[in-house]
Amino acid sequence: QRINTEKETLPKPIIWAKPSIMVTNGNSVNIWCQGAQSASEYQLYFEGSFFALERPKPSRSMNKVRFFISQMTSHTAGIYTCFYQSGELWSKSSNPLKLVVTGLYDTPNLWVYPRPEVTLGENVTFFCQLKTATSKFFLLKERGSNHIQNKYGNIQAEFPMGPVTRAHRGTYRCFGSYNDYAWSFPSEPVTLLITGGVENSSLAPTDPTSSLDYWEFDLSTNESGLQKDSAFWDHTTQN
């Protein structure tokens, strides 16, 4: 197991998940850790505990390894980091990678007030309701502004969008979460259409094939201003 040495350390590796950092319960996910060509060992940590290691074969001149999680569950959802060793030196820790498991327990209902088709500048609020008591709700927009909002609530949460702009148009889903990394099934999608304005268009997003596996997003909270969490931006975390 890795020994902490503060003096000489190698640059931190990059960690990311494929196909997504949001994984349906029971599905597999790959965690990639990219370090250096000369790395002799990679170690993956989960919630601060040693999870797995990989020793690349010398014949394969690769600077990254894949850790395969065969079945995602609430027990494997959480924060992952990785390290690599080259010679006698260990790298610094990668940035944290936050893996979320979805598809647990129940399915929330999502609706939009006053209606799914609104005019530019109109006030819009999304409502997410889940029969199972939960601690937090997440509203995600598919392939759009890469932005998640979350709200605390027991059975229902509301997401006021304010006066809408064209940037708000798109398809939304919501989740209830049982903790930050264990989420419900997704709601049915709700598509927000914006009419009026200069370009009189009520187009939905052009790609109708968007799915959970290809969402890229930013996790932020609207409780106390906007706090961005870089580990949820894209599927790769690096600085």
Epitope: F46, A52, E54, F68
Partner: nanobody
Framework: EVQLVESGGGEVQPGGSLRLSCAAS????????MGWFRQAPGKEREFVAA???????YYAESVKGRFTISRDNAKNTVYLQMSSLRAEDTAVYYC????????????????????WGQGTLVTVKP
């Protein structure tokens, strides 16, 4: 569906040896990463040793140099050779598998394993 059946447990004196076996059903054994865990009475389950699908191994510090993990893909079996046994090695020993897996990964955390055996009891006492 993979089934794991451990055998080889029993009572042994301090300093003695035992070899545990874990027989796996199914054709997926060659693509599985395997591990041994143990749970002593009143304690949490802990990692003992693991082996990748390409025979790379890793051991808990407490058993390093005393225990050896190996696998025989032809027999769909993983072994844990235990020697220089101590009283603190007394526990129920569980075999576990990650199926499928790729590359050369050795899994150390119990959460990574998706198949478990029922366990076999090892008792070390004079």
């Amino acid at each position: 569906e993979v089934q794991l059946v451990e055998s080889g447990g029993g009572e042994v004196q301090p300093g003695g040896s035992l070899r545990l076996s874990c027989a796996a059903s199914g054709r997926t054994f060659a693509s599985a990463a395997m591990g041994w865990f143990r749970q002593a009475p009143g304690k949490e389950r802990e990692f003992v040793a693991a082996i990748s699908r390409s025979d790379d191994t890793y051991y808990a510090e407490s058993v390093k140099g005393r225990f050896t993990i190996s696998r025989d893909n032809a027999k769909n079996t993983v072994y844990l050779q235990m020697s220089s046994l101590r009283a603190e090695d007394t526990a129920v020993y569980y075999c576990a598998a990650v199926v499928p897996t790729y590359g050369n990964t050795i899994y150390v955390h119990s959460a990574a394993y998706n198949y478990w055996g029922q366990g076999t009891l090892v008792t070390v006492k004079p």
